[in-house]
């Protein structure tokens, strides 16, 4: 017996209760590929997430993070708090970079200043919490 489900396009599911006819996905659900036996629940962008792309019958919703947060993980699976430049996020919140380190972004960790002397160069511009040192000529 031919499997009629393979004829069901994206946006539908193969309804075994209706002799394998293709039924439309219910509201707030989708199927991105043909031949599916069920639809998938749409992702809901709530809390620190905001909707970047609405769910449709053929594709899931896509989320971004609200202002003050940035995405982490595949498909923005998590939102992490932004810090100011010159800071890094710790378990206790945003903390200033220690002397000798910098962070020029609102995310990520503080990194050590470049050691100019390793390349036989001198420091042309001193580093700050927000900026790396600038090495001058040797």
């Amino acid at each position: 017996l031919q499997d009629l489900c393979s004829n069901c396009p994206a946006g539908t599911f193969c309804d075994n209760n209706r002799s394998q006819i293709c039924s439309p996905c219910p509201p707030n659900s989708f199927s991105s590929a043909g031949g599916q036996r069920t639809c998938d629940i749409c992702r809901q962008c709530k809390g620190v997430f905001k909707t970047r792309k609405e769910c449709s019958s053929t594709s899931n919703a896509e989320c971004d993070c609200i202002s003050g947060y940035h995405c982490l993980g595949a498909e923005c699976s998590m939102c992490e708090q932004d810090c100011k430049q010159g800071q890094e996020l710790t378990k206790k919140g945003c903390k200033d970079c220690c002397f000798g380190t910098f962070n020029d972004q609102k995310r990520g960790i503080c990194r050590p200043w470049t050691n100019c002397s390793l390349d036989g160069k001198s420091v042309l511009v001193n580093g700050t919490k927000e900026r790396d040192v600038v090495c001058g000529p040797s």
Partner: nanobody, 122 residues
């Protein structure tokens, strides 16, 4: 056993109104996501309207927004679809539907009734 019994269809002129009813048994309308699908002659099923999130939100197809209103009477365990400003393209068999959420995240729906015919014609 889940049963859905639709009524209220009929022949109506363009611009007219109808109210469809769906008497449910075997489950509680107020505790489920429920709605209406329709099948026009020679066409596939189409979602018309639904009450979602246990009543927290409603869905309307673009083609019926502002003309159709979905509601329910918890005491009577009945779902309604108030249809106004009806058009020829609303002609279809209307089915009451219960959205089913499966373990593992899948979503389908059940239509157990025979449906009710709505014909919009002058």
């Amino acid at each position: 056993e889940v049963q859905l019994l639709e009524s209220g269809g009929g022949l109506v002129q363009p611009g007219g109104s109808l109210r469809l009813s769906c008497a449910a048994s075997g489950f509680t309308v107020s505790a489920e996501d429920v709605g209406w699908v329709r099948q026009a002659p020679g066409k596939g099923l189409e979602w018309v309207s639904a009450i979602l999130d246990k009543g927290g939100s409603t869905y309307y197809a673009e083609s019926v927004k502002g003309r159709f209103t979905i509601s329910r009477d918890n005491a009577k365990n009945t779902l309604y679809l108030q249809m106004s400003s009806l058009r020829a393209e609303d002609t279809a068999v209307y089915y009451c539907a219960r959205i089913v959420y499966h373990a593992g995240g899948g979503v389908t729906f059940d239509t157990r009734g025979q449906g009710t015919q709505v014909t919009v014609s002058s």
